[in-house]
Interface confidence: low
């Protein structure tokens, strides 16, 4: 008995060939001996089976002695043994129809689980192997689960169902809903405008939901909601914004926030959450703000940074074109009685300057100038 595997929703063509290369009498039946279709001269006739409107043949092939049964929009319950009766002989074909579906939706939030469920006909014992877009292989039986979906899991998953040494391949497009970056850090001098961008790592036709930016300032004992907004068909509208600081928000995607100025009391880290319509859970992106201030008070030149800096970051004060006068893995450095000239405060990581602030120290009878 020949075995043919089909995919739910697809079309399958079961072949039946006569020895004579001409149009002769044939008919297809199911295992209950119910006629599905056949011919009467050059006409196609259909029987009373449940396949009625989904069954067809190719009349153009009859003259060559080929009498295929075409079943459209396959269902799991179409799995059966089909019998072609032609020239006093019977050809049996076992059709097994499988379906592979994602648990709820093919659009899943980062960190959520993907469950693929195999629908199979009674009596079958298939094995399934899926390959993710990043090349990860998972194997299983009726269900396969992948926990903690990552951004790289977005794309086409290719799953192979194996039964009776035959295989059928499914392709499922999974969209992992996430921000492009899990975390970002912005370095700014005091007073500078700060731009925060939250690009999404996916595109969908309609995007609706709501979001909020919570901010934990380094100086504050508790976090505070800085802004809440709605997203409707990719249009952003602000619902509520604190008055200090007053963030401005772009009206289109990508989500874009502007802090009018970087101030020490704003330095810290924020968490932007985005809840999408008809989705449980939220998208998250962490954003960090580091603020630098260089000041001269009397005979003390000080450089300070606020915000989440790593212990390996170096803070230095140097006179332009000279060696660093002071360099420490601390958040504040200072020089007593600095000589006149343009001083640079540098925040660097392994030699790479992340943030720089210049302050002009005038001869002792003048006041400092901050460019």
């Amino acid at each position: 008995k020949k075995v043919v595997l089909g995919k739910k929703g697809d079309t399958v063509e079961l072949t039946c060939t006569a020895s004579q290369k001409k149009s002769i009498q044939f008919h297809w039946k199911n295992s209950n001996q119910i006629k599905i279709l056949g011919n009467q001269g050059s006409f196609l006739t259909k029987g009373p089976s449940k396949l009625n409107d989904r069954a067809d043949s190719r009349r153009s092939l009859w003259d060559q002695g080929n009498f295929p049964l075409i079943i459209k929009n396959l269902k799991i319950e179409d799995s059966d043994t089909y019998i072609c009766e032609v020239e006093d002989q019977k050809e049996e074909v076992q059709l097994l129809v499988f379906g592979l579906t994602a648990n709820s939706d093919t659009h899943l939030l980062q960190g959520q689980s993907l469950t693929l469920t195999l629908e199979s006909p009674p009596g079958s014992s298939p094995s399934v192997q899926c390959r993710s877009p990043r090349g990860k292989n998972i194997q299983g039986g009726k269900t396969l689960s992948v926990s903690q979906l990552e951004l790289q899991d977005s794309g086409t998953w290719t799953c192979t169902v194996l039964q009776n040494q035959k295989k059928v391949e499914f392709k499922i497009d999974i969209v992992v809903l996430a921000f492009q970056k899990a975390s970002s850090i912005v370095y700014k001098k005091e007073g500078e405008q700060v731009e925060f961008s939250f690009p999404l790592a996916f595109t969908v036709e309609k995007l609706t939901g709501s979001g909020e930016l919570w901010w934990q300032a380094e100086r504050a004992s508790s976090s505070k909601s800085w802004i809440t907004f709605d997203l409707k068909n990719k249009e952003v509208s602000v619902k509520r914004v604190t008055q200090d600081p007053k963030l401005q928000m772009g009206k289109k995607l990508p989500l874009h926030l502007t802090l009018p100025q970087a101030l020490p009391q704003y330095a810290g880290s924020g968490n932007l959450t985005l809840a999408l319509e008809a989705k449980t859970g939220k998208l998250h992106q962490e954003v960090n703000l580091v603020v630098m201030r260089a000041t001269q008070l009397q005979k003390n030149l000080t450089c300070e940074v606020w915000g989440p800096t790593s212990p390996k970051l170096m803070l230095s004060l140097k006179l332009e074109n000279k060696e660093a006068k002071v360099s420490k893995r601390e958040k504040a450095v200072w020089v007593l009685n600095p000589e006149a000239g343009m001083w640079q405060c540098l925040l660097s990581d392994s030699g790479q300057v992340l943030l720089e602030s210049n302050i002009k120290v005038l001869p002792t009878w003048s006041t400092p100038v901050q460019p």
């Epitope: 005091e190 007073g191 405008q193 604190t242 008055q243 007053k246 009018p260 100025q261 020490p264 009391q265």
Partner: antibody, heavy 121, light 111 residues
Amino acid sequence: QVQLQQSGPELVKPGASVKMSCKASGYTFTDYVINWVKQRTGQGLEWIGEIYPGSGSDYYNENLKDKATLTADKSSNTAYMQLSSLTSEDSAVYFCARKGENGNSLAFAYWGQGTLVTVSA
Amino acid sequence: DIVLTQSPASLAVSLGQRATISCKASQSVDYDGDSYMNWYQQKSGQPPKLLIYAASNLESGIPARFSGSGSGTDFTLNIHPVEEEDAATYYCQQSIQDPCTFGGGTELEIK
């Protein structure tokens, strides 16, 4: 302690402009927004707008945005408000105000004493 | 804009009694458990003075006879017991939405 010292009263003619000041002391001027509030004689309070002295960014009440222009001078710790094309409707006391810290950061905790502007021919 | 309606417009209360001032907002000023409503006192020829912030928090240096309550759209300022120096105009102000807006004021007279 935080103090906001405003300039003295102004008597101006209709159609003219006036510029008043608000000098801040007792805190880092560039760390906080300066707000301006209008109060007509015997009337309530109306928020005009605000300025971030650090960056110069300003925001206005849409109903009053063509009337006022807000500026700030970091070197003198002073915020300014200029009112243009004055009419009798602009005769009022104008206050500068600063919000508080921590819990009261969305309330006007500090106020200037007010500048009286009288528009009269 | 959010409209704040204060009542009564004026109020006369005997010394030592309770003064109650109401403020109704045209839409909720609550968000995430907080009410963004503040109360100010203004005496003639002086700037307003912050009494209560976030609906019920007493500003530093303000006597405990002042108290605020309410949430959503209905807020109340209570003064008990009223003292001579409390004669003034009282304003509510919302800070949840720009532009921030003030109520029309309630004038308190001490009998």
